[in-house]
């Protein structure tokens, strides 16, 4: 056969469908690869051909469009299953061609099973709801094109194994599920089952999504730097390790990029000729507020390093903040000599205790990774 532009296996489109449910799958050529649509291609005399490779087989074979009750059919650029079977899993190819032109792409289709509580290997979309924000809705996804607008389906919503009925703050409203006010307890998987008739048969569409309740924009604040702060002085002798944590709290903000960085004498650490390492850790609250900690570490600090300015910076969509760490070189403790000896132990102990850092009144206590002597 003549040459064909082969776009290969489009693994970006990992299509998953439930067993024993209708599925309509559009040929990805017109979605992602070609600059014209099916109608244009059809009127230009191009034909769309479908074939498939079964799971764990290498042999490409035509799709059987002569199954009882037209179980598999093609309509324009859509491949229809009414309904799917488990062994429909495989790689499907759509090819657009005429005598002078050919283009094709393959994509994987996985038919998955679900249990009575709608658990399955299906990858679930996540819908974020703001905590205590007023009425918010989720909509039963990916049901367009399955039945005409003249057909009125029945829609049942579930949370896990349980039909959503008599819930305090969640109300099913057809294709929508309304949350009068969202709380942490509303986190979880929600399933809509759409039931519709077609040619004397009844079909079900099952769609599950994960609801995650997140911090409300009403409560969002600019980044808050908890450390460094005015209550902690980093006092070191040359040769010691300097460790300064920068701990920043970020309110949850939809699609916001949270950033934390250090500057040393106004420059990025990479642009300073000293051996600095920075380790970052990130933790999240239940409402996806974020705490980022970047620990700046200089293994063997010099007296020059102890004169530098160390500033922690943070930025989110709500604003930018910065805070300098108070770094000092330790002054050696004066050696007192008292006639008759003794009497200085307590004083030396006080200086020993303040060898690393000074904690001044109030303030948040953090676990700094310092060596306390």
């Amino acid at each position: 056969s003549e040459r064909c532009d082969d776009w290969g296996l489009d693994t970006m489109r990992q299509i998953q469908v439930f067993e024993d449910e209708p599925a309509r799958i559009k040929c990805p050529l017109f979605e992602h690869f070609l600059k014209f649509n099916y109608s244009t291609a059809h009127s230009a005399g191009l034909t769309l051909i479908w074939y498939w490779t079964r799971q764990d087989r290498d042999l490409e074979e035509p799709i059987n469009f002569r199954l009882p009750e037209n179980r598999i059919s093609k309509e324009k650029d859509v491949l229809w299953f009414r309904p799917t079977l488990l062994n429909d899993t495989g790689n499907y190819t759509c090819m657009l061609r005429n005598t002078t032109y050919c283009s094709k792409v393959a994509f994987p289709l996985e038919v998955v099973q679900k249990d009575s509580c709608f658990n399955s290997p299906m990858k679930l979309p996540v819908h974020k709801l703001y905590i205590e924000y007023g009425i918010q809705r989720i909509t039963c996804p990916n049901v367009d094109g399955y039945f005409p607008s003249s057909v009125k389906p029945t829609i049942t919503w579930y949370m896990g194994c349980y039909k959503i009925q008599n819930f305090n703050n969640v109300i099913p409203e057809g294709m929508n599920l309304s949350f009068l006010i969202a709380f942490i307890s509303n986190n979880g998987n929600y399933t809509c089952v759409v039931t519709y008739p077609e040619n004397g048969r009844t079909f079900h569409l099952t769609r599950t999504l994960t609801v995650k309740v997140v911090g409300s924009p009403k409560n969002a604040v600019p980044p808050v730097i908890h450390s460094p702060n005015d209550h902690v002085v980093y006092e070191k002798e040359p040769g010691e390790e300097l460790l300064i944590p920068c701990t920043v709290y970020f309110s949850f903000l939809m699609d916001s990029r949270n950033e934390v960085w250090w500057t040393i004498d106004g420059k990025k650490p990479d642009d300073i000729p000293i051996d600095v390492t920075i380790n970052e850790s990130i933790s999240h609250s239940r409402t996806e507020d974020e705490t980022r900690t970047q620990i700046l570490s200089i293994k063997k600090v010099t007296s020059e390093d102890l004169k530098r300015s160390y500033v922690c910076h943070a930025r989110s969509a709500k604003g930018e903040v910065a805070k300098a760490a108070t770094v000092k070189q330790k002054v050696p403790a004066p050696r007192y000599t008292v006639e008759g000896g003794g009497g200085t132990g307590g004083l030396n102990d006080i200086f020993e205790a303040q060898k690393i850092e000074w904690h001044e009144g109030g303030g948040h206590h953090h676990h700094h990774h310092h060596h306390h002597h």
Epitope: S116, Q165, F167
Partner: antibody, heavy 122, light 107 residues
């Protein structure tokens, strides 16, 4: 370790009501459902209904609609089953049961209370 | 509602022997079936769910099989503590329904 502890045995007159409690200890943070099941003497198990304490959702078996009310007090991790218009055939052991989450297919009756005997007699 | 029918009503078995209990659903329940054990004066205990998955702490001598409408609970070698009443339950459709039970007694 999650446990369910039910209230003590009751003797009731026909036409009256009974309210059985079921207290959960060691409850997980995730929402869960409390089921109510009854067993008449020498008979099988009969599902009555459920409640999801943290979300308020509930449902009852058709047979008990209008006579049963299942409620919950989240602050004390206690669920209640009230059955009204009692008749002699309501004499049974009433059990509460639960799973760990709302999602465990087949494990919604994972943990059981010890049962409460309700005797309806004139 | 789905009716669950268990057979036999009573099964007499000697210790060490195999016991096979049957449960039939009035319509397909897929693999959404559980088995419970109940001893006199005690609450039921979950043995098997998903037709064949043993619950936590259940000995390997208990096994479940079947799907659709026909299910079996097998106790490979009966121990003295296994003499009890066994119930099947479907959780495919609301309302969830139980069978009437099979009593396994000492022969």
């Amino acid at each position: 370790q999650v446990q369910l502890v039910q209230s003590g045995a009751e003797v009731k007159k026909p036409g009256s009501s009974v309210k059985v409690s079921c207290k959960a200890s060691g409850s997980p943070a995730e929402p869960y459902a409390i089921q109510w099941v009854r067993q008449a003497p020498g008979q099988g198990l009969e599902w009555m209904g459920y409640i999801i304490p943290s979300l308020g959702g509930y449902d009852y078996a058709q047979k008990f609609q209008g006579r049963v009310t299942i409620t919950a007090d989240e602050s004390t991790s206690t669920a209640y089953m009230e059955l009204s218009s009692l008749r002699s055939e309501d004499t049974a052991v009433y059990y509460c049961a639960r799973g760990q989450t709302l999602y465990d297919s087949g494990r919604q009756f994972d943990i059981w209370g010890q049962g409460t005997l309700v005797t309806v007699s004139s | 509602e789905i009716v669950m029918t268990q057979s036999p009503a009573t099964l007499s078995v000697s210790p060490g022997e195999r016991a096979t209990l049957s449960c039939r659903a009035s319509q397909s329940v897929s693999s959404n079936l559980a088995w419970y054990q109940q001893k006199p004066g005690q609450a039921p205990r979950l043995l098997i769910y998903g037709a064949s998955t043993r619950a936590t702490g259940i000995p390997a001598r208990f096994s479940g099989s079947g799907s659709g409408t026909e299910f079996t609970l097998t106790i490979s070698s009966l121990q003295s503590e296994d003499f009890a009443v066994y119930y099947c339950q479907q959780y495919n459709n609301w309302p969830w329904t139980f069978g009437q039970g099979t009593k396994v007694e000492i022969k």
